[in-house]
């Protein structure tokens, strides 16, 4: 069973009148449409919530909205709609928050249907006054910050005009025409798709891709035959047509697309599709479906050049283009990662690797838990975790898996115990190793969230019946105490707190109901009197992460290196507070070939740690092209995994192979590639 | 089978300092935590502070902050304790302890390993 | 710094006895608890760790429960070889032992 609620866990005396003191109600003047609430800065406390209400009348959709700001993390909200003229804004854009602490919002308000261009409203101090600005095109997406200087914007028309702010918004340029996608890179630099024929439906497959590093002044053609685009970590991918047929395939740049190297991963049909699950600067993840509408496909990951590419998983769960899948980092852990796999017999199985997709294995059971009736056998089952397929499929799972960087090992998750996903109701799992070992936290569906970089975790029970109710551990979920924050329940709709989990307030959201009417209503519960002291080093203890085999000399050893953490104790009631730095210690491990990839041209037999050479790459579809034109290519046949530190040990020398190959694309040899200047 | 053998017997003066050694062998001494306690005569166990030969973090119980300093030499599989300003009431057999280890708390799951004592004697 | 109280301190039994020790923190430790024998002039011997897992080469009579602050070791029936001294040691603060309970012959 799950670990007792209220359970003597001698943690925090005398809670009920500490949390009775840091609860703050607000209830908002608003008949109950849709809200949505942003955070605005790092610290700063500041939210705005946007309230919006629908009323569809016989010709036409009446609409209001309004704006509320919060500078206490949620304890008090000031109707703030008069700053914005008491204009309707348009939730499908969201509130658009600027990068890092650069205070800037842009909100995107609704406009009557004559007129020559949107509206937005700017504010570049945390929302304390907005500028309106009438603009002279119909946006089409939301505003899109440059992540290096705030001041920029990007935006698509409803008409596909690529638009370019250089002062946050107040004057727009329209730089390019029939652009289809526009993405901001490093450095400022934009790149986009554009068309030639009419529309972006019709010209999929015959695109241009375009890149101008000086805001719209020049511009240089970097792809054509272009299907889509993406960028992940340092790398540009560009999915190109082949000439011969209706297949594509992935090329890949490190350069800004001056240069480009066609992927060693299949080619895909007209119905199939590449995803970029994960991507740093280090490697990727790409899924590449399989072909006809099997709901899956497999998981290669790269090596450092995004060229090479090994077989990570099979049978991988990805419904369609844009889809659901389950991938899911553990940002609690390095190298960690869950998905879901569907197995032959059509059951959906959870998979999880601790060494950035070279291995997957299945969860491990619970210790407090039975295997249900998904398992052949009941002493040998596996934990398996639901995540964005079962809540696209209306399972009972209001939330996806939790972790936080800051709150080291902790991952929390709804999960059923079995052979494979189970449609019963399921219950919440907490692992605190980064996903090695499980614990059934709490009975049945809940909403969760970490708070204080783990020192609090705070959940709510998922109900259709109004609630009054929070639960929250300062034991990592160990044991659990219950307050009742209000005597009137209120039906549930969401927990907010500030990203990052560094903070000690939570956002409980819901609404009233009576005879008449329905309103918002939050209450903000302040968690700083349940951690009286600040930590000290006594209230931490060490920890090895990936630590499996204490016999074995290189335990924890994972991508060539090891960490031992300070975590706090499970028993220790203290605050990590809001400038809690993780404290960690890597120590470098020796080398095994565990610690390499096999090169271009060479592979790994099943069950065995060598490389051997493709013999005469025969019959494998490894068409190599790099910097699209004829190479030598020399390896000894191993790659260092990317981001792997490993030194000394087994340093696996070969003779040189010469695998001069002819390059079979066409794609953008540098003579093709022009540039332009407006 | 792990082994902690422990260095001899000591006697010292008041005030002056003592370093017990504590050497590892048959097992792998980097990757678990030591622990050294201490026993005085007819009384309980007293933990004073551990070590974990991996970065050589080692940490204290507050009663021996300051008097204690605890150091492990991977390349030998040795820990030492060093206690200083010896009192009369330092007397006692001091053990190291390996901390048993099932998952990657260090010092969690008792000591399963232990030195066979080294007595220390504090007298004028 | 954690406390941990052990009782009784001495407790005077038979071969073939049930004998129960109890230890109590100070506050909740979860199940960070362990329990050693020790003869004289021997080093202390792990019996129990994590208040209920029984280390290896240890006889099944020895058992351990309980979680958050209050734990008991149980010997469910008294051996020759059981007559010692058992402390208990708390691993989720700086780590603290109890007390002892000797256990003698009645």
């Known amino acids: 069973s799950a670990p007792g609620e209220d359970e003597e866990c001698g943690r925090v005396r005398d809670f009920v009148a500490k949390l009775a003191n840091n609860t703050h109600q607000h209830v908002f003047d608003d008949l109950r449409g849709s809200v949505s609430l942003s955070w605005v800065g790092d610290s700063t406390g500041v939210i705005l919530v946007l309230t919006t209400f629908h009323v569809p009348l016989v010709i036409m959709t009446f609409g209001q909205s309004k704006l509320y700001r919060s500078e206490d993390y949620g304890k008090n909200f000031k109707d703030i709609t008069d700053l914005i003229n008491n204009t309707f804004i348009r939730t499908e854009f969201g509130m658009a928050i600027g990068p890092e602490n650069s205070g800037k919002v842009v909100l995107t308000a609704e406009v009557s249907g004559g007129s020559r261009g949107g509206r937005i409203f700017r504010s570049s101090d945390f929302a304390k006054n907005f500028v309106q600005t009438d603009l002279p095109f119909h946006p089409l997406t939301q505003m899109m910050y440059s992540p290096q200087n705030s001041d920029y914007l990007l935006a698509l028309s409803t008409e596909n005009g690529l638009w370019v702010s250089k002062n946050f918004g107040g004057k727009w340029e329209e730089i390019h025409k029939a652009v289809c996608l526009a993405k901001w890179g490093s450095d400022n630099t934009i790149f986009f798709t554009t068309y030639a024929n009419g529309s972006c439906k019709a010209d999929l497959g015959a695109l241009e891709l375009w890149r101008t590093s000086d805001l719209g002044k020049s511009f240089k053609t970097i792809g054509v035959k272009i299907y889509s685009f993406g960028l992940g970590g340092r790398f540009l991918f560009a999915s190109v047509m082949a000439d011969k047929d209706t297949t594509r395939r992935i090329h890949v740049s490190t350069d800004q697309g001056d240069t480009w190297s066609m992927a060693q991963l299949p080619s895909v049909g007209q119905e199939q599709f590449y995803s970029i699950l994960a991507a740093n600067d280090d490697m990727v993840f790409m899924h590449v479906d399989e072909p006809g509408d099997t709901g899956f496909g497999t998981i290669f990951t790269s090596d450092d050049r995004g060229i090479v590419y090994s077989k990570s998983l099979d049978r991988h769960l990805y419904t369609t283009t844009g889809g659901e899948t389950d991938f899911t980092n553990v940002t609690s852990l390095r190298g960690v990662y869950i998905t879901s796999v569907l197995s032959e017999d059509n059951s959906i199985q959870t998979m999880i690797t601790f060494d950035q997709g070279g291995r997957w294995t299945h969860l491990r059971k619970p210790e407090n838990s039975e295997c249900d009736a998904t398992a052949k056998n009941k002493n040998e089952c596996s934990l398996h975790i639901h995540a964005s397929y079962s809540i696209s499929q209306k399972l009972n799972v209001p939330m996806a898996p939790l972790s936080e960087p800051n709150a080291v090992g902790i991952v929390i998750a709804h999960g059923s115990v079995g052979d494979a996903i189970s449609v019963m109701v399921p219950d919440v799992y907490i692992s605190d190793d980064g996903g090695y070992s499980w614990t059934k936290m709490l009975e049945g569906p809940h909403y969760y969230t970490i708070l204080d970089s783990g020192g609090i975790i705070v959940a709510i029970e998922h109900s259709s019946r109004p609630i009054n109710v929070i639960k929250f551990s300062t034991a990592e979920g160990q044991c659990w105490q219950t307050y009742t924050f209000t005597r009137d329940p209120i039906y549930f709709t969401g927990l907010a707190s500030e990203p990052g989990a560094r903070s000690m307030n939570i956002s409980i959201w819901g609404f009233t109901e009576s005879f008449l009417t329905s309103q918002w209503v939050s209450y903000t519960i302040d968690f700083k009197d349940i951690l009286e002291r600040n930590c000290e080093e006594k209230d931490y203890t060490i920890w090895l992460a990936h630590s499996t085999d204490p016999e074995d000399y290189e335990d924890g050893c994972i991508l060539g290196y090891k960490e031992q953490f300070l975590r706090l104790r499970k028993s220790s009631v203290c605050q990590n507070g809001r400038d809690y730095v993780v404290t960690k210690q890597p120590s470098i491990c020796l080398c095994s070939l565990e610690d390499f990839l096999c090169d271009f041209g060479y592979y790994r037999p099943e069950n065995d740690s060598k490389c051997v050479e493709q013999p005469e790459l025969k019959g494998h579809d490894l068409e190599f092209c790099l910097y699209g034109r004829e190479e030598h290519l020399t390896t000894n046949g191993y790659r260092k995994i990317p981001g792997d530190k490993c030194q000394g040990g087994v340093n696996p020398v070969r003779e040189v192979k010469d695998l001069k190959k002819k390059c079979t694309s066409n794609f953008l040899s540098p003579e093709k590639q022009n540039s332009k200047s407006n | 089978q792990v082994q902690l053998v422990q260095s001899g017997a000591e006697v010292k003066k008041p005030g002056s300092s003592v370093k017990v050694s504590c050497k590892a062998s048959?097992?792998?001494?980097?990757?678990?935590?030591i622990s050294w306690v201490r026993q005085a005569p007819g009384q309980g166990l007293e933990w004073m502070g551990g070590i974990i030969p991996i970065g050589g973090w080692a940490n204290y119980a507050q009663k021996f902050q300051g008097r204690v300093t605890i150091t492990a030499d991977e390349s030998t599989s040795t820990a030492y304790m060093e206690l200083s300003s010896l009192r009369s009431e330092d007397t006692a057999v001091y053990y190291c302890?390996?901390?048993?280890?099932?998952?990657?708390?260090?010092?969690?799951?008792?000591?399963?390993?232990w030195g066979q004592g080294t007595t220390v004697t504090v007298s004028s | 710094d954690i406390q941990m109280t052990q009782s009784p301190s001495t407790l005077s039994a038979s071969v073939g006895d049930r004998v129960t020790i109890t230890c109590r923190a100070s506050?909740?430790?979860?199940?960070?608890l362990a329990w050693y024998q020790q003869k004289p002039g021997k080093a202390p011997k792990l019996l129990i760790y994590k208040a209920s897992s029984l280390e290896s080469g240890v006889p099944s009579r020895f058992s351990g429960s309980g979680s958050g602050t209050e734990f008991t070791l149980t010997i469910s029936s008294l051996q020759p070889d059981d007559f010692a001294t058992y402390y208990c040691q708390q691993a989720d603060g700086h780590i603290t032992f109890g007390g002892g309970t000797k256990v003698e012959i009645k």
């Open positions: 048959g097992g792998t001494f980097r990757n678990y935590a």
């Open positions: 506050q909740s430790i979860s199940s960070w």
């Open positions: 302890a390996r901390q048993g280890r099932k998952t990657g708390y260090y010092y969690y799951y008792g000591m399963d390993v």
